[in-house]
């Protein structure tokens, strides 16, 4: 399956925080989305192979890495002034 953690996270002003996403499905592609209240999902970043990733529609204030196939952590940087949202990680073949 796919595991995202933590379930809840509080960020102090000026801090970077990292959300973990791990999958054991042997999927090549992984995605991070953000959902704000009353809105649909918006793509932040996606990765289609190890060590390669592309910006989605709202990448500013976020960073990612894809050091291994199973993992695609998302860092919410201090430059992201409005980080409060629901974050969803997904993967696909």
């Amino acid at each position: 399956g796919i595991t995202q953690s933590p379930k809840y996270l509080f960020r102090k002003e000026g801090q970077n925080v990292t959300l973990s996403c791990e999958q054991n499905l042997n999927h090549d592609a992984m995605y991070w989305y953000r959902q704000d209240p009353g809105q649909g999902l918006r793509l932040i970043y996606y990765s289609q192979i190890v060590n390669d990733f592309q910006k989605g529609d709202i990448a500013e204030g976020y960073s990612v890495s894809r050091e291994k196939k199973e993992s695609f952590p998302l860092t919410v940087t201090s430059a992201q002034k409005n980080p409060t949202a629901f974050y969803l990680c997904a993967s696909s073949i």
Partner: antibody
Framework: QVQLQESGPGLVKPSETLSLTCTVS?????????WNWIRQFPGKGLEWMGY???????NYNPSLKSRITISRDTSKNQFSLKLSSVTAADTAVYYC?????????????WGQGTTVTVSS | DIQMTQSPSSLSASVGDRVTITCRSS???????????LHWYQQKPGKAPKLLIY???NRFSGVPSRFSGSGSGTDFTLTISSLQPEDFATYYC?????????FGQGTKLEIK
């Protein structure tokens, strides 16, 4: 900052096995990425030989497949190249290399290179 | 294997010149994921190659803006808009779309 350093004999006799080791500092080879061997012939042509992945799996150049083995020693954070049945055509500068984050498979961390001469 | 053919093999130019090096692959370098893994390296004598451009047109960290990459499919170009003295070196294209990864034969850029 990832740093790589090759070590091994500079002279190998024909028909013997070439053995080189790459020591990695600044990053654990089990944490991610692909750990490559690339060689450069005296005429300056570059050849990708193969890699060992963070999970220990391999991908080799088919032109070398019957002769090449890339292995690792995770306790020493090293990966190694063995090339059997060498001939003078294997004389080259051998580099270990790994990709730079976010570039696909484009490598930008390189060892300094070690010259291997195959001669009796 | 994918053959990578660079032209010219050598080139003489002067400081301030605009220089273009081309690289042609024997097959399309578009990956099944729609990305194109074509890269350019610079190598100086006695040193390891250095990454200049990755994925056709992305300048690597610290690479001056006078270097640019373009192209698609099988035909690619590295352009140096205004040659500087430190740019005289050998340039290689490389593909990592298909295994085995392969390199062009190199283009040696010399001072005229």
């Amino acid at each position: 900052q990832v740093q790589l350093q090759e070590s091994g004999p500079g002279l190998v006799k024909p028909s013997e096995t070439l053995s080189l080791t790459c020591t990695v500092s600044g990053y654990s080879i089990t944490s991610g990425y692909f750990w490559n061997w690339i060689r450069q012939f005296p005429g300056k042509g570059l050849e990708w030989m193969g890699y060992i992945s963070y999970d220990g799996s391999n991908n080799y150049n088919p032109s070398l497949k019957s002769r090449i083995t890339i292995s690792r020693d995770t306790s020493k954070n090293q990966f190694s190249l063995k090339l059997s049945s060498v001939t003078a055509a294997d004389t080259a500068v051998y580099y270990c290399a790994s990709p730079s984050p976010g570039t696909g498979y484009a490598v930008d961390y390189w060892g300094q290179g070690t010259t291997v001469t195959v001669s009796s | 294997d994918i053959q990578m053919t660079q032209s010219p093999s050598s080139l003489s130019a002067s400081v301030g010149d605009r220089v273009t090096i081309t690289c042609r692959s024997s097959q399309s370098l578009v990956h099944s994921n729609k990305n194109t893994y074509l890269h350019w390296y610079q190598q100086k004598p006695g040193k390891a190659p250095k990454l200049l451009i990755y994925k056709v047109s992305n300048r690597f960290s610290g690479v001056p803006s006078r270097f640019s990459g373009s192209g698609s499919g099988t035909d690619f170009t590295l352009t140096i808009s205004s040659l500087q003295p430190e740019d005289f070196a050998t340039y290689y294209c490389s593909q990592s779309t298909h295994v085995p990864f392969t390199f062009g034969q190199g283009t040696k850029l010399e001072i005229k």
